[in-house]
Amino acid sequence: SIPWNLERITPPRYRADEYQPPDGGSLVEVYLLDTSIQSDHREIEGRVMVTDFENVPEEDGTRFHRQASKCDSHGTHLAGVVSGRDAGVAKGASMRSLRVLNCQGKGTVSGTLIGLEFIRKSQLVQPVGPLVVLLPLAGGYSRVLNAACQRLARAGVVLVTAAGNFRDDACLYSPASAPEVITVGATNAQDQPVTLGTLGTNFGRCVDLFAPGEDIIGASSDCSTCFVSQSGTSQAAAHVAGIAAMMLSAEPELTLAELRQRLIHFSAKDVINEAWFPEDQRVLTPNLVAALPPSTHGAGWQLFCRTVWSAHSGPTRMATAVARCAPDEELLSCSSFSRSGKRRGERMEAQGGKLVCRAHNAFGGEGVYAIARCCLLPQANCSVHTAPPAEASMGTRVHCHQQGHVLTGCSSHWEVEDLGTHKPPVLRPRGQPNQCVGHREASIHASCCHAPGLECKVKEHGIPAPQEQVTVACEEGWTLTGCSALPGTSHVLGAYAVDNTCVVRSRDVSTTGSTSEGAVTAVAICCRSRHLAQASQELQ
Amino acid sequence: QEDEDGDYEELVLALRSEEDGLAEAPEHGTTATFHRCAKDPWRLPGTYVVVLKEETHLSQSERTARRLQAQAARRGYLTKILHVFHGLLPGFLVKMSGDLLELALKLPHVDYIEEDSSVFAQ
């Protein structure tokens, strides 16, 4: 008898007739930038403080009738979803509301900027515990709004935003496109993407995860005890803001990078029917539905990793695409993908003192994506070892030669346009797992890391006959850090990580002869970090 | 630049004409860029966020805003500074004619200018 959305985000161990997970986010303050709200609604009375901040445009239309309950509708519902007594996610969280949307639900980029500045100034004047900022709004792509979000995130604030309700690529909207913001798409009770009239939830690489966003019961501003069902990516974002408040209340020292990784880690995986998304967006859209962690503590010192896709490079011959990790994350591997199969591989390179993953388009190619594997690896010391193209027919190889360094990822990059079209595959010699192997025409890049308690192993899955997709997964307790194809023959479209599985995609089988050339091997590098206690002993 | 410390609200008419040239040369030869919303119905022309370079101080932001007003006034344009940003991004929000964008982009410390646009509840 509890609302479906609360049941969906609750791990089975908490489920009963009631929704009462431990600690309701009481150490966290959630800022809501939205419409005005009805603060005396019984769901939120005493837990939402209405600030004096208001920056809204005038309503459109000369005959617009301002009705208080309609003006408050959107914000009241979202405040209820985040922290409502009876139908809220983080029942203990306190909230502060800023009015940046008018009675028609419309605001401006400038008003939102001034609101974000107000939050930053409040934070400086009176530092409190962890802050979560919920932005249940969207406009067109805005460099300045994204920049402001970046600055606020770097000041330690967690920003959560709606992906947008335009059934479109979320990267075309702000603040959804800001990398530092946690961007949330909406799913329904059947774990399907939400359709809203002729439109629906946004999707794509700028979405971090999905959350319940259809028929969400929450506080209605129609009366102080009323409830109403609303739908949208705002409702989905409110769920994630609530979950974030719960996590931060349990572990107040979590950084944004740690929080994002945990949100991804504890999400339900592969439950969304991807057929709803446009075909070209399916691989880019995370198949994740947010959930609370099974226990507020005990995530411990697991190795958390996520996959970050770059923007598309575009089709020009020398076009490149770059994928970046967040400031607190380590780039442990780099791969690339092209729908046409025409690419010149990828490499890890330093940019502004940090490693990035760069993929290279090839002549006649429609463009490439770079795919970074970004991980939380405290006290890590990582470097890239490169072997230039080899003269020998054995192929190019590179390994981690520094004491205590382990291989976390392999990349290969070549200058020639049609690498390996008529060449047999190069196989890794047995008994040498700590090295990357590739074609003699390619330069090979090994990501080598040293971190307390870090151990890695290589896992391969080869299929002799051609197949459109070959996968290899890391077993329980191990985390996928590297994903690549062996060999880099021309019919391989690329490799990428989906959760803990390495996926190698090849061209349509019908266009490839079933010769030995069709053989594809997916290579996963699986790592784990032994318990922090052991790690600290190693350091001594 | 000597005119940077002037009180432009009081000295609009007294400014020497040659100072115009000083103000219009951007620093370090970098060109500030202009951005606007790709979705036409969401654009709000007439209001602009002028974003200044990262290390710009509040006093410089205020001076740059006053300088824009002064130069606009000499060209017969009214402008209104709606807000001066500091704390997150240095810059200011200005209500002005789009005709002044070229002028504004040449002001010192300017990184980029973005036309205001609408956001919507989702």
């Epitope: 008898s1 005890t225 069902s229 | -």
Partner: antibody
Framework: QLQLQESGPGLVKPSETLSLTCTVS??????????WGWIRQPPGKGLEWIGS???????YYNPSLKSRVTISVDTSKNQFSLKLSSVTAADTAVYYC??????????????????WGQGTLVTVSS | EIVLTQSPATLSLSPGERATLSCRAS??????LAWYQQKPGQAPRLLIY???NRATGIPARFSGSGSGTDFTLTISSLEPEDFAVYYC????????FGGGTKVEIK
Amino acid sequence: QLQLQESGPGLVKPSETLSLTCTVSGGSVSSSSYYWGWIRQPPGKGLEWIGSAYYSGSTYYNPSLKSRVTISVDTSKNQFSLKLSSVTAADTAVYYCARENSGVVPAAGPNWFDPWGQGTLVTVSS
Amino acid sequence: EIVLTQSPATLSLSPGERATLSCRASQSVSSYLAWYQQKPGQAPRLLIYDASNRATGIPARFSGSGSGTDFTLTISSLEPEDFAVYYCQQRRNWFTFGGGTKVEIK
């Protein structure tokens, strides 16, 4: 069929605390579908809502009585109780307990007081 | 606080007659208004909710209308058991009750 029954002392001295309990039968106070409320009626006068409570512990009270009221739900005994402190003669009334749909589960029915207990008269006198 | 004013205070009618009771709110309560019936020595009973919906088991002779600030309870043909006190209640902003209208036998 759901029934509610109020119980508690019929006489309370001024400045003391009035304590009443409502026992629920034919239903559960642990349901997320309902709030459990108290309403009072001074002799010959109209009705006044005192406050309501939810199984999870959330409560809300009439602002005019808020400083003196505590309502709690005891799921183990399937009952809920009212405590009203610092009573005066003006608190003499028939006290009713009633169920109210929380609105969280829309199918549970209208968001009003229904059913009610039969009421218990509490007199405040020394 | 929203104040509900009921009129008349007393309504003297005979069985079979039509009874019209009024409830006026000090500010709009939209349609968030209910009517209760209370007989001597008994608890109130919900008759009409959300201005015009009959509660379970309530005879069709009872009907409610109105929205905003003005509401009416109509008993189309009074039965002997209908003589009682009737209260309106709003939930637009917390809960308040009207002072009541007593329907007595003429």
